[in-house]
Structures are given as structure tokens and as C-alpha cells.
């Protein structure tokens, strides 16, 4: 006999919630695998600038993305299938996975906060290397793509430690249109914008992490309530 009333509502709520979660995981995994295997984007992600490889942060980033996508799909499937099948075993595994993920998120949050300066330094180094490559090797479309992504995302251009030729190339080719790099001497310094992102805008990442944590707790509660509901309904 299946669950009834409020518990049934929780069952479908958990199903829909985890179906969306599973889909999102699929999208992330798909994009990550595409980035990993597409030649153009592989060059971009594993950008080797001269004899300097991209910082470790970026090298590892793609695998983190693959892992996140796979875990999201697995956990989403457990929650989805466990809810629709009313399986205490699957829901219990789902709950355990959520607890582990919650612990991982807290650990990642602490690690990220502690290492934010190093991460910011890596990002700045990556930008500088990409910019140097885009200027020295004017055929390096991957490097140009990286530089333009930085410029458009952070609404910045260049840094305060530029060579003459880099300044000229930036002004004419790589700065976002309307950027006042020249009239307002490096006011839109990308190094500064990266620092701002990791210090001033850190609260935004914190808010996002809290939202994810709240959703996780909410899902844990729902899965436990449903599990108890299934146990109780099987007694009668």
C-alpha cells in the first residue's frame, strides 16, 4: 500500500525536486565532458602559454566539474527513484549522500575562504599568461578567447603592469568596446577586479553556498519524513 495525504505530496515534491537536480547534473556533466574532449576548448582549458602551463586551479577545474555533474546525477537519481518507488533503502542512501555532500560543501567553503588569496593569485596569473600569449602569438585564438572572457565578465581591461605593445594591442583589439583604458589610465584594471571579486564579492558566493546548504537540509528533512511515512504505511 502506498503513502497517502501529506506524505504523498512530499513524495512527488521530492521526485520533481530531484528530477530537476538530476537534469542539472546531466547538463553539467555533458558540458564538462564536451569541454574535456572538444579540441578547441581543451586547448583553452589546458592553455600552455610558452613554457608555463595554466595554473593548477584551472587544470583541476574541469575534473571537479565532471565530478560535480556525475555526483548530482547519481544523487538526483537516488532521490528521484527512491521517492517514486517508495524505497526506504534508496531514500536512506540518498539521505547519507546528502549528509556527505553537505559536509563536503562546508569543507570546500572553508578551504575556499582560507585559500581565496591563492586562488585570486592563480586567476591573475592565468589572465596575465593568456594576455601575453594573445599578444606574442597573434594567431592564438584560445588565448584571445580567455582574455576577452575576462574582459567582458569582469568589465575590465589590462592591468597596471603592461608593456607598450600589450597596451597598444589591448586598446585596438582586446578591450571591450567603450572601455576607457586610455582616457582613464588603467582604471579598469583586471587584477583589481579579480581581487574585488574574491574579497568584496565573496559574500555573493557565501549567499549561494547558504542557499545550496538550505536546499540540502530541506531535502534531508523531506527524505526522512518520506522514509518514516513509508515505514508507517507498511505497518498498517
Amino acid at each position: 500500500m502506498g503513502v497517502e495525504g501529506c506524505t504523498k505530496c512530499i513524495k512527488y515534491l521530492l521526485f520533481v525536486f530531484n528530477f530537476v537536480f538530476w537534469l542539472a547534473g546531466g547538463v553539467i556533466l555533458g558540458v564538462a565532458l564536451w569541454l574535456r574532449h572538444d579540441p578547441q576548448t581543451t586547448n583553452l582549458l589546458y592553455l600552455e602559454l610558452g613554457d608555463k602551463p595554466a595554473p593548477n586551479t584551472f587544470y583541476v577545474g574541469i575534473y571537479i566539474l565532471i565530478a560535480v555533474g556525475a555526483v548530482m546525477m547519481f544523487v538526483g537519481f537516488l532521490g528521484c527513484y527512491g521517492a517514486i518507488q517508495e524505497s526506504q533503502c534508496l531514500l536512506g542512501t540518498f539521505f547519507t549522500c546528502l549528509v556527505i555532500l553537505f559536509a563536503c560543501e562546508v569543507a570546500a567553503g572553508i578551504w575556499g575562504f582560507v585559500n581565496k588569496d591563492q586562488i585570486a593569485k592563480d586567476v591573475k596569473q592565468f589572465y596575465d599568461q593568456a594576455l601575453q600569449q594573445a599578444v606574442v602569438d597573434d594567431d592564438a585564438n584560445n588565448a584571445k578567447a580567455v582574455v576577452k572572457t575576462f574582459h567582458e565578465t569582469l568589465d575590465c581591461c589590462g592591468s597596471s603592469t603592461l608593456t607598450a605593445i600589450t597596451t597598444s594591442v589591448l586598446k585596438n583589439n582586446l578591450c571591450p568596446s567603450g572601455s576607457n583604458i586610455i582616457s582613464n589610465l588603467f582604471k579598469e584594471d583586471c587584477h583589481q577586479k579579480i581581487d574585488d571579486l574574491f574579497s568584496g564579492k565573496l559574500y555573493l558566493i557565501g549567499i549561494a553556498a547558504i542557499v545550496v546548504a538550505v536546499i540540502m537540509i530541506f531535502e534531508m528533512i523531506l527524505s526522512m519524513v518520506l522514509c518514516c511515512g513509508i515505514r508507517n504505511s507498511s505497518v498498517y
Epitope: V136, D137, D138, T163, A164, I165, S168, K171, I182, S183
Partner: antibody, heavy 119, light 112 residues
Framework: EVQLLESGGGLVQPGGSLRLSCAAS????????MSWVRQAPGKGLEWVSY????????DYADSVKGRFTISRDNSKNTLYLQMNSLRAEDTAVYYC????????????WGQGTLVTVSS | QSVLTQPFSASGTPGQRVTISCTGS?????????THWYQQLPGTAPKLLIY???NRPSGVPDRFSGSKSGTTASLAISGLRSEDEADYYC???????????FGGGTKLTVLG
């Protein structure tokens, strides 16, 4: 040994055109930015234009913008400067120079070719 | 009128030390762009003498040295020799004009 040899200079009437060439040897031409710098008789040096290794990036001094065109042929190790609508003030010795990214300066220069604009 | 200002001429006797200044502004030398120095012997093409404010390319004697402070760069020649008689040009990049700029040049005369 790095060598840059300019040619194509001469006497031309105002409004006329001229094409300068610079033959490069002794280094990997296709990997280097190249530039033109000129020097009016008895005067100082004036940067004219630069071109990146694969011709993607170019820039010009305001005084020649729209009249001069810089180009290169990496298969021939040659740099060019097409000069149109020439004026008396364009009279100068035109030097071809290699731009060093590492040094951020013009590290090697040709011997120059004289362009005289006169009626 | 050049963007970078150099003395029109300088002179010294053999063995002496001579300094040539190059004054710019906050849009070139003062903006952090490197200053380079070129030597032009009579009737020849310019030759890179000092790059990146104070670095000497191989083959340039250590009698030549460069420095930079604020908006002014300097070229010092110690143990002056007769073969040092030439025009000396400083060069930087101007971010307002978006061009490579040169000084007007300094004619160095070795006396006696």
C-alpha cells in the same frame, strides 16, 4: 646575424604613392612584430607603424593613419609599407625595425631608405 | 616639440662622465612604461643602447647605464671616448597618444 635591408625609397611628387620593402634575415621573421620608424632630415625619430607576427594587429601614428598601410609576407621574410597621398612632411629616412616583445623596444634596425616628397 | 624632452646637446672630455636626461609625463614614463635609449652614430641607423630603463643588450659596454625616477629617465656614460660622439634618443610609450614616442635627441660632443 640579424639583418634588415630597406628598399623602394626615392623622389615622388606630393599626392603620389610609394611602396617600401624591408628584407629580413638572421632571425625567425614570422615570430616577430615589425615596425617602421622615420627620421626627417636633421630631425628626430618618429614611430610610424607596427604589425604583429601574423598580421592580426596593426597600428599607425595619427600623422599617417588612412594614408599608409603596413603589411608583411612571412613566406618571403619581407615587410612592406604602402604610402599613398604623400605630403612634403613625409620626407624622411624610413627605417624598418624589429620589435622585441621581451625587451619591449626596437632592438634591430635597418640602414634606412630615403623618401623625398617634392614637386 | 617632442613628447619626451631631452637637452639639445651635451659635451665632455675623454674619460669624463656625462648624463643625459629625458623628461616625460604621467602618461608615458611616469605611467610605468619602460624607457629605452638609442645611439645614432653619424650617417648610420639607430642602435639599441639601453632597454627596460637600465638593461644593456649584449655588446654594449658597461660604461653605458640607464636609470629612471618618476617621470624622468637618465642615460649615464662614464669614461667618455671619442667614438661615443653621436645622437642619443630616449623612447617610451604614451598611453594618451597611443604611440611610441621619442625624445628630440641629444647631440653628444667629445671635446679635445
Amino acid at each position: 646575424e640579424v639583418q634588415l635591408l630597406e628598399s623602394g625609397g626615392g623622389l615622388v611628387q606630393p599626392g603620389g604613392s610609394l611602396r617600401l620593402s624591408c628584407a629580413a634575415s638572421g632571425f625567425t621573421f614570422s615570430s616577430n612584430y615589425m615596425s617602421w620608424v622615420r627620421q626627417a632630415p636633421g630631425k628626430g625619430l618618429e614611430w610610424v607603424s607596427y604589425i604583429s607576427s601574423s598580421s592580426t594587429y596593426t597600428d599607425y601614428a595619427d600623422s599617417v593613419k588612412g594614408r599608409f598601410t603596413i603589411s608583411r609576407d612571412n613566406s618571403k621574410n619581407t615587410l612592406y609599407l604602402q604610402m599613398n597621398s604623400l605630403r612634403a612632411e613625409d620626407t624622411a629616412v624610413y627605417y624598418c625595425a624589429r620589435y622585441s616583445y621581451g625587451r619591449d623596444s626596437f632592438d634591430y634596425w635597418g640602414q634606412g631608405t630615403l623618401v623625398t616628397v617634392s614637386s | 616639440q617632442s613628447v619626451l624632452t631631452q637637452p639639445f646637446s651635451a659635451s665632455g672630455t675623454p674619460g669624463q662622465r656625462v648624463t643625459i636626461s629625458c623628461t616625460g609625463s604621467t602618461s608615458n614614463i611616469g605611467a610605468g612604461f619602460d624607457t629605452h635609449w638609442y645611439q645614432q652614430l653619424p650617417g648610420t641607423a639607430p642602435k639599441l643602447l639601453i632597454y627596460g630603463n637600465s638593461n644593456r643588450p649584449s655588446g654594449v659596454p658597461d660604461r653605458f647605464s640607464g636609470s629612471k625616477s618618476g617621470t624622468t629617465a637618465s642615460l649615464a656614460i662614464s669614461g667618455l671616448r671619442s667614438e661615443d660622439e653621436a645622437d642619443y634618443y630616449c623612447q617610451s610609450y604614451d598611453t594618451n597618444l597611443s604611440v611610441w614616442v621619442f625624445g628630440g635627441g641629444t647631440k653628444l660632443t667629445v671635446l679635445g
